[in-house]
């Protein structure tokens, strides 16, 4: 059962796993949610009746029954983890805590103009978990405007104390606001020889990389595969760090793989969700339950639905025994990973999918697409919407992309003559325009947010957000697309598609069926050569064939330029402008979405 509200002046008795320090009960709940075993917590707020050394303590708790006895205690705030809930969860915490000093290892001290600048510095520093900033009113003259970057083993403060005229806050890496590079490559036959901060068992290097990503101290990792010569180290995932933030030494070793934390790309790739099955593999751990199940998929469902289950092993049924049902072993451990991994016993193992909700919905794999041809199939581009105007009569106006459950990203130039959001309708999950009838459900638009600097498409800033009146329930036919990570600026996308109901030639009409075209990206230098009278800025991105023939056209405006990278689709561009349509040596020009991620997050996360 999902319980989101906090229980004031209430303490849960027993079940303690560990104690951490958090600046608020709300953040204690987030820490509990991300902890592999925590189901409940008790936070102690500052209060004259409480010993100051207990202020800001966040006691993480577990219980076999998923609840604990409640005791009345002033200043105690208790609650449940969001593990029991089905909604999206985020560790992003933009709150600034006034007059609180969050203690940790102060590894960097510098002058900053504001707390915001200090927070940005922390966000862009690979080691930083949180910061404390002494304001210009701070009593000690030499400490005024000092920004202290801090880290700890757990990522949370070692202690929190009251201190006048300082403010503290957390790194915004988990808000997708870091400019740090996103290095997704996994390097085969490589060992990073740096200090280990932790080690866990993992079935493959991808899971190891994801574990590294949500471990607060891990910057890179080395994984020993099951063919690694030293048997005791097989399937071992070593979580590593270094002072520089990069591996100091790389050693060539067969059957080892190494890679980096995906902290700076976590909003555009899954980092919590280990959805694969591992055949002929047994995961060992503390047994929670043994249940009969028809298949390993059914076993994974059972594990996902059992809040304390972290991973499972399924042993298929022997011949006709037990109505063809096998045994499903639901398991857990202290850190969420198997205590040992064995091969060759015939089991099929995997992880709970409960953690998938901690990943951005946009990272969910969509149905395999049918490549070739120009008409799309249903569910192929589930983020694509058709934006209609109802004035003076109803018609398709532009394309757009679902980027959140209340947000559509589109082009600013679509709103020429649109005097009010009231005349707009957003239709999602549509393949054919002919499906749209009087009674077809749509999303009303609450607000049109156009970039302040937009003047005309050709000079850039051709980007707009639509805030919907109601939220989108994600399904196979309507779901969000990931925004590119700022750390992905140097990625070379090779699988890019433009989609829309627009014209198929310059003098044409809106198409009934959603069209798609695979189009290669063109460098900005090359694009600038093709548009000598224009300034192709870094905030624009171009795509097209030298010989022309495939391009976006009138009516495709505002729609996505979607690029697949590492099995995840990213909204790389917004259809903006071009000379004619599909002309030779005249690529289409798109709004370069990665350059507007800050703007998008600022507008969509505004209170």
């Amino acid at each position: 059962e999902c319980v989101t509200q906090l229980l004031k002046d209430t303490c849960f008795e027993g079940g303690d796993i560990t104690t951490v320090f958090t600046p608020s009960a709300k953040y204690c709940q987030v820490v509990c949610t991300y902890h592999p075993r925590c189901l409940l917590f008790t936070f102690t707020a500052e209060s004259p009746s409480e010993d100051p050394t207990r202020w800001f303590t966040c006691v993480l708790k577990d219980s076999v029954t998923e609840t604990l006895p409640r005791v009345n205690r002033t200043a105690a705030i208790s609650g449940y983890s969001f593990k029991q809930c089905s909604h999206q969860i985020s560790a992003c915490n933009k709150d600034i805590y006034v007059d609180l000093d969050m203690k940790g290892i102060n590894y960097n001290s510098s002058v900053a103009k504001s707390a915001q600048e200090c927070q940005e510095r922390c966000t862009d520093d690979v080691h930083c978990h949180f910061f404390t900033y002494a304001t210009r009113q701070f009593p000690s003259l030499e400490h005024r405007n000092i920004c202290l970057l801090k880290h700890t083993q757990t990522g949370t403060p070692t202690r929190i104390t009251k201190l006048d005229k300082v403010v503290s806050g957390f790194s915004l890496k988990s808000c997708a606001l870091s400019n740090l590079a996103c290095i997704r490559d996994i390097f085969p036959n490589t060992v990073f020889a740096d200090s280990n901060i932790d080690s866990v068992m993992a079935p493959d290097a991808f899971v190891c990389g994801r574990i590294c990503t949500h471990h607060p101290g891990c910057l890179f990792f080395t994984f020993f595969s099951q063919e690694w010569p030293k048997e005791s180290q097989r399937n071992l995932c070593l979580l590593k760090t270094s002072e520089s933030g990069l591996p100091s030494t790389r050693i060539k070793k067969s059957k080892a793989l190494s890679g980096f934390s995906l902290q700076s790309c976590r909003h555009s790739i899954p980092v919590f969700c280990h959805s694969s099955f591992y055949h002929d593999t047994d995961f060992l751990g503390e047994e929670l339950d043994i249940v009969a199940a028809k298949s390993h998929e059914a076993c994974q469902k059972l594990c996902t639905n059992a809040v304390r289950c972290q991973f499972f092993t399924y042993t298929p049924a022997q011949a006709s025994c037990n109505e063809g049902k096998g045994k499903c072993y639901l398991k857990l451990s202290s850190n969420g990973s198997p205590t040992k991994i064995l091969h060759g016993r015939g089991g099929i193992s995997g992880y709970t999918l409960r953690l998938c909700k901690m990943d951005n919905e946009c990272t969910t794999k969509i149905k395999p697409r049918i490549v070739g041809g120009t008409a799309s199939v249903r569910g192929e581009w589930p983020w694509q919407v058709t934006l209609h105007t109802t004035s003076p009569t109803q018609r398709h106006l532009c394309g757009g992309s679902i980027i959140g459950n209340q947000w559509i990203l589109t082009a600013a130039h679509c709103f020429y003559g649109v005097e009010s959001p009231k005349i707009l309708r957003v239709y999602s999950g549509i393949l054919n325009q002919s499906e749209i009838k009087e009674d077809t459900s749509f999303f009303g638009v609450q607000e049109i947010i156009i970039h302040d600097q937009y003047k005309m498409a050709e000079s850039g800033y051709d980007i707009a957000l639509l805030k919907l009146e109601t939220t989108v329930n994600y399904t196979d036919s309507q779901r969000p697309i990931c925004l590119p990570s700022k750390g992905d600026r140097n990625v070379i996308y090779t699988d890019c598609w433009v989609t829309g109901w627009g014209y198929r030639k310059l003098r044409d009409k809106i198409q009934n069926t959603l069209q798609k075209a695979k189009i290669p990206l063109v460098t900005n230098e090359e694009c600038q050569k093709r548009y000598r009278g224009h300034k192709i800025t870094h905030k624009m991105i171009c795509a097209g064939y030298r010989e022309g023939g495939k391009d976006a056209c009138k009516g495709d405006s505002g729609g996505p330029l979607s690029c697949k990278h590492n099995e995840v689709w990213h909204l790389v561009g917004i259809t903006s402008w071009g000379e004619g349509c599909a002309q030779r040596e005249r690529p289409g020009v798109y709004t370069n979405v990665v350059e507007y991620v800050d703007w998008i997050l600022e507008k969509t996360q505004a209170v």
Partner: antibody, heavy 118, light 112 residues
Framework: QVQLKESGPGLVQPSQTLSLTCTVS????????VHWVRQPPGKGLEWMGI???????SYNSVLKSRLSISRDISKSQVFLKMSSLQTEDTATYFC????????????WGQGTLVTVSS | DVVLTQTPGSLSVTLGQQVSISCRSS???????????LEWYLQKPGQSPQVLLY???NRLSGVPDRFLGRGSGADFTLKISRVEPEDLGVYYC?????????FGSGTKLEMK
């Protein structure tokens, strides 16, 4: 409701500088663009320039050298300054608000007549 | 700068008559973003102008459907299917595709 009102001197000496104010209400100058348009008596409309909502300005190329548009967001006012006035600058001066984008002009002031004469 | 030429300069009409006003541009008004930023305004005697159509043919709310806009590229027409007394005044085309923006010379619609 949305309103724009032009104000300024009715009479200006030749070679002097014209200063007009457009005071707006019902919307913010950081959300919408404001244009200046003029109309000599018995003649057609002439677009003069725009105060973009981000604070940039653009001008009619013929008038550019003697025209300046500025604003005071806190007072919801847009200002037009035009130097070296001649009798042919006698006109009704309008300010108008753009739509969600630059145009169309969905709201106009009632205009203010400026006569250039000695 | 873009020059918009309107013809005729004036029109004498009877009520219920259909009229056409032409607006020719010195260059194409089709923007590279797919929109054509061509608008029509009516200025009634002693009043400020009011917008009728935007994007060649789109009527703003409250504008009667007897006003019809046509055209593409550099050639545009405003048609009034049946002239009513409140339609009298001066009609201007206006372009916002190319900076600086420009108005047409105007067409005066008056009663015979």
């Amino acid at each position: 409701q949305v309103q724009l009102k032009e104000s300024g001197p009715g009479l200006v000496q030749p070679s002097q500088t014209l200063s007009l104010t457009c005071t707006v209400s019902g919307f913010s100058l950081t959300t919408y663009h404001v244009h200046w348009v003029r109309q000599p008596p018995g003649k057609g409309l002439e677009w003069m320039g725009i105060m973009w909502r981000d604070g940039d300005t653009s001008y009619n190329s013929v008038l550019k050298s003697r025209l300046s548009i500025s604003r005071d967001i806190s007072k919801s006012q847009v200002f037009l300054k035009m130097s070296s006035l001649q009798t042919e600058d006698t006109a009704t001066y309008f300010c108008a608000r753009g739509g969600t984008l630059t145009t169309p002009f969905t709201y106009w002031g009632q205009g203010t007549l400026v006569t250039v004469s000695s | 700068d873009v020059v918009l030429t309107q013809t005729p300069g004036s029109l004498s009409v009877t009520l219920g008559q259909q009229v056409s006003i032409s607006c020719r541009s010195s260059q194409s008004l089709e923007s590279r973003d797919g929109n054509t930023y061509l608008e029509w305004y009516l200025q009634k005697p002693g009043q400020s102008p009011q917008v009728l159509l935007y994007g060649v043919s789109n009527r703003l709310s409250g504008v009667p459907d007897r006003f019809l806009g046509r055209g593409s590229g550099a050639d545009f027409t405003l048609k009034i299917s049946r002239v009513e007394p409140e339609d009298l005044g001066v009609y201007y085309c206006f372009q916002a595709t190319h900076g600086p923006f420009t108005f047409g010379s105007g067409t005066k619609l008056e009663m015979k």
